[in-house]
């Protein structure tokens, strides 16, 4: 559900939303840390209706959700955190 990508690409998000999305409608969350061509952290949410949205990293709900997912991934198997480096 939670994925962290380190990329050398430019920013992926043109605009960001802060509108809440319930977790049951989320397939996965992709986190792109700032740096390497993009000056800001980006969060991309892949939804179960196959649409994709960039979420404002400052939105309280996404911070809360990522914290919950991190806690679950450290204590249980079903919610892995993937880290992948792309040169």
């Amino acid at each position: 559900v939670l994925e962290v990508y380190y990329t050398s690409l430019r920013c992926r998000c043109v605009q960001e939303s802060s509108v809440f999305i319930p977790r049951r409608f989320i397939d996965r969350i992709q986190i792109l840390p700032r740096g390497n061509g993009c000056p800001r952290k980006e969060i991309i949410v892949w939804k179960k209706n196959k649409s994709i949205v960039c979420v404002d990293p400052q939105a309280e709900w996404i911070q809360r959700m990522m914290e919950v997912l991190r806690k679950r991934s450290s204590s249980t198997l079903p919610v892995p955190v993937f880290k992948r480096k792309i040169p």
Partner: antibody, heavy 121, light 106 residues
Framework: EVQLVESGGGLVQPGGSLRLSCAVS????????MAWVRQAPGKGLEWVAS????????YYRDSVKGRFTVSRDNAKNSLYLQMNSLRAEDTAVYYC??????????????WGQGALVTVSS | DIQMTQSPSSLSASVGDRVTITCKAS??????LTWYQQKPGKAPKRLIY???ILQTGIPSRFSGSGSGTEYTLTISSLQPEDFATYFC????????FGQGTKLEIK
Amino acid sequence: EVQLVESGGGLVQPGGSLRLSCAVSGFTFSDYYMAWVRQAPGKGLEWVASINYDGGDTYYRDSVKGRFTVSRDNAKNSLYLQMNSLRAEDTAVYYCATEEDYDGSYVMDAWGQGALVTVSS
Amino acid sequence: DIQMTQSPSSLSASVGDRVTITCKASQNINKELTWYQQKPGKAPKRLIYNTNILQTGIPSRFSGSGSGTEYTLTISSLQPEDFATYFCLQQSSLYTFGQGTKLEIK
């Protein structure tokens, strides 16, 4: 008092169309995700579709994708379900329900009284 | 898709009995489970959400527990008005209801 009132049910032939409405009062409609749930006669409950606050995001169970469309009009405090290419297996009581506010504690909390849709020739 | 297996499908009990209904999920649903009561011709009524939080106005004889894939609804002392059908609902990934448990008077 929270109220959800469905209308638009009835008898329709296979392949036909029907539009259900759900009139809402007693809470700030635009603050909630909304859902449609159905129940075939004598059977269990089945989630049909959900829609986000402004109608820009919709979700459907696989068996109704491409046939049903959920929509809303926040100015009219109304939720809709357009049902096309109806099949006998769509026969059910259709309920609208509040689905989600920000903190998640209102999931499927308030329900309407239901609208019966019968698909038969 | 997550499947919910509810058991038993029907249950006969007497007033004052303690009753337990179980729902098993096909995968971990992280306590995102709701229980409903439904009477004939009526809409479902929410009893418990997030596994164990009692809905306002619901008597304390109803309780919920569980984690991972297994969840239970317990009625500690059945009252005449409790004879109805009960459903569980997982809301971890989209929505799936259990098949229902019809609670009848013995």
